[in-house]
């Protein structure tokens, strides 16, 4: 056989579906791969081919599609599964080509069993919510091309294993979920079943994700730097070992980018000669609100560091603020023997 | 630590109706489902159903769907179990026990109720 | 309904022997099943869940596997306190069901 442009295995689109419900799945070639879509391609007379190798074999064969009420079958790009079966487990190769010209790629589809609470190894998508911010809603994701706009399908919608109905605080409202006023109780997992017919059969789409409430733009400030502060100055003498922890608290922002740096003399530690190590350690709050610590620490002090700047940065998108620690030589103790004798007027 | 502590023991007559309690302490009630298991004298165990301490809707066993009513209150962080047509075999001890809302394991129970159904 | 069916009913055992417990499901639960001690007098306590997790506080003695229709439950080391009866219960399908239970009794 002529030569194939193979896009190897794309496990960037690592799909799982469920085990007994439908499932679409789109060959990645037009979507991420080529520069064309499927009916440019079909019209140019490509045809696309599927095939599949089993989970734990490496035999490539020819997708059935002549199973009992069409369970799996070919529409356009997309193949179709009604309903999945566990054993549809493995790795499915799409290829277009006719004479001339070929291009294929493979991708991993995993049927996963749920649990009577949805619990299964899906990864779930993560949506945040703002916490006492208004009415903020969820949609039902990833039912789009499963049925005809003619058909009113019915969703259900559970948090775990729980039926949403008559809540003050949620309401189901068709594919949207609705959340008057955001609360951490909120927090969990919330699975959409969505039911229509087709030819007769029922099917159910099931679609979890995982609902994370977070701290309100309302409420949001710049970093605030706990440490270092006016309060504490960090006296040392020479050959002793320097701490100063660096303490930033970054309210929640989404897509907002925290960092934290000290600058000793104007300069990152990187660009200087002494011998400095920076450790940073990061805790969150039940609403993501974060604290990062970076611990500065230079193991023997010289008395020309104890003369340097230690400024402790921070950034968000809400701003940039900056603090300089209290930094100091240590006078030493006046040895009694000789400076405070000396002080008396012994001789 | 979490506790769940349950109303005393009852007898009953055949055709009247219990009301079980289970009182949470040590966990946020609102956090977590309360399901309800009993167990005939010498035999095993049989769930009856569970509910979401947060949203108050109940999922039930076919067995007892209609004569079993399982609440929550949020306020006292106290879940119900009422059961109503008793007859001779509903003679068990009724236990409650706390699961996540998306678990299906029952991490605490409390002490058990026995309900004792004679005329 | 899923019926679990648990062996033997009864395991005739002296501390120190090793106790292997078996569930068999009528149809397939994944991994979505647990496992229960019961004390005379005493509520269940939970052992094992997700097939093979230990539930916080279990000793490593107690020990799950199995997946699909067949699982196991062991003991590596009976100690005295390990007498009693154990059930498995299942959480894939409504309703949740349990074993009849394994009665595990000093030799």
């Known amino acids: 056989s002529e030569r194939c442009d193979d896009w190897g295995l794309d496990t960037m689109r690592q799909i799982q579906v469920f085990e007994d419900e439908p499932a679409r799945i789109k060959c990645p070639l037009f979507e991420h791969f080529l520069k064309f879509n499927y009916s440019t391609a079909h019209s140019a007379g490509l045809t696309l081919i599927w095939y599949w190798t089993r989970q734990d074999r490496d035999l490539e064969e020819p997708i059935n599609f002549r199973l009992p009420e069409n369970r799996i079958s070919k529409e356009k790009d997309v193949l179709w599964f009604r309903p999945t079966l566990l054993n549809d487990t493995g790795n499915y190769t799409c290829m277009l080509r006719n004479t001339t010209y070929c291009s294929k790629v493979a991708f991993p589809l995993e049927v996963v069993q749920k649990d009577s609470c949805f619990n299964s190894p899906m990864k779930l998508p993560v949506h945040k919510l703002y916490i006492e911010y208004g009415i903020q809603r969820i949609t039902c994701p990833n039912v789009d091309g499963y049925f005809p706009s003619s058909v009113k399908p019915t969703i259900t919608w559970y948090m775990g294993c729980y039926k949403i109905q008559n809540f003050n605080n949620v309401i189901p409202e068709g594919m949207n979920l609705s959340f008057l006023i955001a609360l951490i109780s909120n927090n969990g997992n919330y699975t959409c079943v969505v039911t229509y017919p087709e030819n007769g059969r029922t099917f159910h789409l099931t679609r979890t994700l995982t609902v994370k409430v977070v701290g309100s733009p309302k409420n949001a400030v710049p970093p605030v730097i706990h440490s270092p502060n006016d309060h504490v100055v960090y006296e040392k003498e020479p050959g002793e070992e320097l701490l100063i922890p660096c303490t930033v608290y970054f309210s929640f922002l989404m897509d907002s980018r925290n960092e934290v740096w000290w600058t000793i003399d104007g300069k990152k530690p990187d660009d200087i000669t002494i011998d400095v190590t920076i450790n940073e350690s990061i805790s969150h709050s039940r609403t993501e609100d974060e604290t990062r610590t970076q611990i500065l620490s230079i193991k023997k002090v010289t008395s020309e560091d104890l003369k340097r700047s230690y400024v402790c940065h921070a950034r968000s998108a809400k701003g940039e603020v900056a603090k300089a620690a209290k930094v100091k030589q240590k006078v030493p103790a006046p040895r009694y023997t000789v400076e405070l004798a000396c002080g008396f007027g012994a001789t | 630590q979490v506790q769940l502590v349950q109303s005393g023991a009852e007898v009953k007559k055949p055709g009247s109706s219990v009301k079980v309690s289970c009182k949470a302490s040590g966990g946020t009630f609102s956090s977590y489902a309360i399901s309800w298991v009993r167990q005939a004298p010498g035999q095993g165990l049989e769930w009856m159903g569970g509910i979401s301490a947060i949203f108050g809707t109940a999922n039930y066993a076919q067995k007892f769907q209609g004569r079993v009513t399982i609440t929550a209150d949020e306020s006292t962080s106290t879940a119900y179990m009422e059961l109503s047509s008793l007859r001779s075999e509903d003679t068990a001890v009724y236990y409650c026990a706390r699961h996540l809302h998306n678990g299906i394991h029952l991490d605490y129970w409390g002490q058990g109720t026995l309900v004792t159904v004679s005329s | 309904e899923i019926v679990l069916t648990q062996s033997p009913a009864t395991l005739s055992l002296s501390p120190g022997e090793r106790a292997t417990l078996s569930c068999r499901a009528s149809?397939?639960?994944?991994?979505?099943l647990a496992w229960y001690q019961q004390k005379p007098g005493q509520a269940p306590r939970l052992l094992i869940y997700?097939?093979?997790n230990r539930a916080t506080g279990i000793p490593a003695r107690f020990s799950g596997s199995g997946s699909g229709t067949d699982f196991t439950l062991t003991i590596s080391s009976l100690e005295p306190e390990d007498f009693a009866v154990y059930y498995c219960?299942?959480?894939?399908?409504?309703?949740?069901?349990f074993g009849q239970g394994t009665k595990v009794e000093i030799k």
């Open positions: 997700g097939a093979s």
């Open positions: 149809q397939s639960v994944s991994n979505f």
């Open positions: 219960q299942q959480g894939k399908h409504w309703p949740w069901t």
